[in-house]
Interface confidence: medium
C-alpha cells in the first residue's frame, strides 16, 4: 500500500508567495508622478513578479510631528483620493494582488510614533484599522515599533481587531532591531503577527553566520510562520554587495516563511549608483529615462526594461524564483533542514511528504568551493539522493535540468544552486 498522504496545513494568502513594499509612491513611479492612479497602471508589472501582496505607503495625511494634523483616515491629496484608492483595490483584487496599508502615523517626522500622546495615537490607529478594513484592505503594516511604548500590548489589540474582522487579514509589524531576544518578546504575545526586522542584516555575509542566524531564528520561533527580509523597509543593496544579491534572492525565496522585498530589489536598485537620490527611497529605474539628472548614469542593464529582455538578469531570476515559490508544495509549506556543506557554504533541504524536494546550496565566499554535503546531519525523512537535477543557478553557464552528482558538487564564488529531486519511499 502507498503511504498515506500528509495532511496539508492551512495556507493563508501571505503563505503563498512574496510581499512587495512600495513605501514611496513618488520614487516608485518617478517622473514627477507618484499617485494611486499611476500605481494602478503598474499592477501588471507586479503580476509579472508573481508577488501576492503589495505593502503600500504610508499614504495618509501627516504634517511632520503634529498629532492633530495627522489623519489616518484621510489620504494625502498628493497621492490621490479615496476613490482612487478604491479603484486601486478593485484592480488589485482582479489581479489577485492583496493590498496591505502602512499606517505608521508620523512617517514624515522624527519619531514615527510621536514622542508624546501615545494613547491618542493608538486610538487613531484603532479607528483607522476599522475604517480601512471596511474599505477592503487586506492588512496593515506598522513600522518602527521600537519607538512605540508598550508595543506588545498595542500590537495584540490591533491584531485582535484585524483578525476579529476576518482571519484572512494580516498585520505586519516592522522593527529596526536585529536583536533576537527583542524580536522574540514582540512575537511572544502576538502569534499570528508577521514581523520584519534587521535580524538578517547582521549576517556579515558569510555562509556559517547566515546559517547560524537562520537556524537560531527558526528554532526559537518554533512552528510559527515567519517572514524573511533584511530590514523593515530598506533595499537589499543597502546591506549587500552586488555579487550577493542573487544569492540572497534565492535564499529569501526558499526559506520557510514569507519573503518580503522592497521595490527595486528585483533589479538590484542601488541608491549609491544614483547621485543625489535618497538611500531609503531612490527612484525606480523603469528605463534609461527614469533618472535624467545625470546623462549616461543609467545603463539599460540597470533598468526593468533592460533586465526584462535578458533571461540571465536579476529580474528574470526573481521572476523564476517567485514562480517556483508559489507553486511547489515543498517551498510553500515544506519542512526545513539545514546541514553542513563546508566552510563558507549554507545548505538546506525543503521537503513536503511525497512531493518533489529541493536542495539549496549557497556559496557566500569569494572563492570556488567543493561542497561536502554532510547527509548525516539530516533525518531519515529528508535523506539526500546521489544525484539531483539542477533547477537553476544564480550564475550563468550551467546546463539547467541536468543531473548533478551531489558528492562532486562544485560552486563558483557567490553561486547559489537550487536542485530538485523526487521523493523516494
Amino acid at each position: 500500500r502507498a503511504p498515506r498522504c500528509r495532511e496539508l496545513p492551512a495556507q493563508k494568502w501571505w503563505h503563498t508567495g512574496a510581499l512587495y513594499r512600495i513605501g514611496d509612491l513618488q520614487a516608485f513611479q518617478g517622473h514627477g508622478a507618484g499617485n494611486l492612479a499611476g500605481l494602478k497602471g503598474r499592477l501588471d508589472y507586479l503580476s509579472s513578479l508573481k508577488v501576492k501582496g503589495l505593502v503600500l505607503g504610508p499614504i495618509h495625511k501627516n504634517q511632520k510631528d503634529d498629532v492633530a494634523q495627522t489623519d489616518l483616515l484621510q489620504i494625502d491629496p498628493n497621492f490621490g483620493s479615496k476613490e482612487d484608492f478604491d479603484s486601486l483595490l478593485q484592480s488589485a483584487k482582479k489581479k489577485s494582488i492583496r493590498v496591505i496599508l502602512d499606517l505608521t502615523p508620523n512617517y514624515r517626522g522624527e519619531n514615527s510614533w510621536f514622542s508624546t500622546q501615545v494613547d491618542t495615537v493608538a486610538t487613531k490607529v484603532k479607528d483607522a484599522l476599522e475604517f480601512w478594513l471596511q474599505a477592503g484592505v487586506d492588512g496593515f503594516q506598522v513600522r518602527d515599533i521600537e519607538n512605540l511604548k508598550d508595543a506588545s500590548s498595542f500590537l495584540a489589540e490591533w491584531q485582535n481587531i484585524t483578525k476579529g474582522f476576518s482571519e484572512d487579514r494580516l498585520l505586519i509589524a516592522g522593527t529596526n532591531s536585529s536583536d533576537l531576544q527583542q524580536i522574540l518578546s514582540l512575537l511572544e504575545s502576538n502569534k499570528d503577527l508577521l514581523l520584519t526586522s534587521s535580524y538578517l542584516s547582521d549576517s556579515g555575509s558569510t555562509g556559517e553566520h547566515t546559517k547560524s542566524l537562520v537556524t537560531q531564528y527558526l528554532n526559537a520561533t518554533g512552528n510559527r510562520w515567519c517572514s524573511w527580509s533584511l530590514s523593515q523597509a530598506r533595499l537589499l543593496t543597502s546591506f549587500l554587495p552586488a555579487q550577493l544579491l542573487r544569492l540572497y534572492q534565492l535564499m529569501l525565496f526558499t526559506l520557510p516563511g514569507t519573503p518580503v522585498f522592497s521595490y527595486g530589489d528585483e533589479i538590484g536598485l542601488d541608491a549609491a549608483a544614483l547621485p543625489g537620490q535618497p538611500m531609503e527611497a531612490p527612484v525606480m529605474l523603469w528605463d534609461e529615462s527614469s533618472f535624467p539628472d545625470i546623462p549616461g548614469a543609467v545603463s539599460a542593464n540597470m533598468t526593468v526594461k533592460g533586465q526584462s529582455e535578458d533571461p540571465g538578469s536579476l529580474l528574470s531570476l526573481f521572476r523564476r524564483l517567485s514562480d517556483q515559490r508559489s507553486k511547489e508544495r515543498s517551498l510553500l509549506h515544506g519542512d526545513f533542514h539545514a546541514f553542513s556543506a563546508g566552510p563558507g557554504l549554507f545548505s538546506y533541504i525543503r521537503h513536503w511528504d511525497q512531493n518533489e524536494r529541493f536542495l539549496v546550496v549557497l556559496n557566500f565566499g569569494d572563492v570556488g568551493l567543493s561542497a561536502g554535503l554532510q547527509a548525516s546531519d539530516l533525518p531519515a525523512s529528508a535523506s539526500l539522493p546521489a544525484k539531483a537535477d539542477l533547477l537553476l543557478s544564480t550564475q550563468p553557464g550551467r546546463e539547467e535540468g541536468s543531473p548533478l552528482e551531489l558528492e562532486r558538487l562544485k560552486l563558483e564564488p557567490h553561486e547559489g544552486l537550487l536542485l530538485r529531486f523526487p521523493y523516494a519511499a
Partner: antibody, heavy 119, light 106 residues
Framework: EVQLQESGPSLVKPSQTLSLTCSVT????????WNWIRKFPGNKLEYMGY???????YYNPSLKGRVSITRDTSKNQYYLQLNSVTTEDTATYYC?????????????WGQGTLVTVSA | QIVLTQSPAIMSASPGEKVTISCSAS?????MYWLQQKPGSSPKPWIY???ILASGVPARFSGSGSGTSYSLTISSMEAEDAATYYC?????????FGAGTKLELK
C-alpha cells in the same frame, strides 16, 4: 463571565419592523465585534451583520438594506431592526460575540429569541 | 459569498461507531470552525482552526481538512454526541454556515 440576552416581541405582523435588544454583561461592547445571527425553522443559520467596538456596522447583502444595527454604550446594549418583514423572517434570533485571535476562538451566544411573523 | 455545503444532512450512528461529517466550501478557506447545537440550547463552539478542540470537547472528536474540503470525525459515538453540527467560515464577510448535520443515536 460574558453573557448576552436577547429581548423583544415574539410576534410581528408582516410589513412591520422587527426590533430586538441584546443586553451584554461581563464585557464591554466598546471592544470587539457584536453580531446578530438567525436560525430559520429548517435549521439554516444566517449571519445578519455586526456592530463593532467603534460603532461601525456591516450588514449581510442578502438582507437588501432592510437591516440596521445600533447600540447604546451607556447601557451596554446593542439593537437589531429589520424592516418590511415577511413570514420568511420567522426565525430564532441570536446575538453573538466572537473573538478570533491567534489560537483562540470564543463565541458567546445569547439563548435566542423566537420571532414569528404572522398576521 | 462563500457557500458551505455539509453532508450528510441527517445521519444516525450506534454507540461506538465512527462518524464523519463533511463540509465543502465554494472557494478555498484557511480554516474551518465547527459548532454543536442541541435542541433548546444555543450553538456552542466545538472545533476551531480546523482541528483544535474547544474547551471541554471530548478527545474522541477531531477535525481535519484544507482548502475547500473539511471534516469533523467522532472516533466512537456516544449518546451525548447526538446533536446538530454546523461548519462555519471566518474567511470573509458575510460569515456563512453549513446547513447543519443532524446526528442521531441509533
Amino acid at each position: 463571565e460574558v453573557q448576552l440576552q436577547e429581548s423583544g416581541p415574539s410576534l410581528v405582523k408582516p410589513s412591520q419592523t422587527l426590533s430586538l435588544t441584546c443586553s451584554v454583561t461581563g464585557d464591554s461592547i466598546t471592544s470587539g465585534y457584536w453580531n446578530w445571527i438567525r436560525k430559520f425553522p429548517g435549521n439554516k443559520l444566517e449571519y445578519m451583520g455586526y456592530i463593532s467596538y467603534s460603532g461601525s456596522t456591516y450588514y449581510n447583502p442578502s438582507l437588501k438594506g432592510r437591516v440596521s444595527i445600533t447600540r447604546d454604550t451607556s447601557k451596554n446594549q446593542y439593537y437589531l431592526q429589520l424592516n418590511s418583514v415577511t413570514t420568511e423572517d420567522t426565525a430564532t434570533y441570536y446575538c453573538q460575540r466572537h473573538v478570533i485571535y491567534d489560537y483562540t476562538w470564543f463565541a458567546y451566544w445569547g439563548q435566542g429569541t423566537l420571532v414569528t411573523v404572522s398576521a | 459569498q462563500i457557500v458551505l455545503t455539509q453532508s450528510p444532512a441527517i445521519m444516525s450512528a450506534s454507540p461506538g461507531e465512527k462518524v464523519t461529517i463533511s463540509c465543502s466550501a465554494s472557494s478555498s478557506v484557511g480554516y474551518m470552525y465547527w459548532l454543536q447545537q442541541k435542541p433548546g440550547s444555543s450553538p456552542k463552539p466545538w472545533i476551531y482552526r480546523t482541528s483544535i478542540l474547544a474547551s471541554g470537547v471530548p478527545a474522541r472528536f477531531s477535525g481535519s481538512g484544507s482548502g475547500t474540503s473539511y471534516s469533523l470525525t467522532i472516533s466512537s459515538m456516544e449518546a451525548e454526541d447526538a446533536a446538530t453540527y454546523y461548519c462555519q467560515q471566518y474567511q470573509s464577510y458575510p460569515l456563512t454556515f453549513g446547513a447543519g448535520t443532524k446526528l442521531e443515536l441509533k
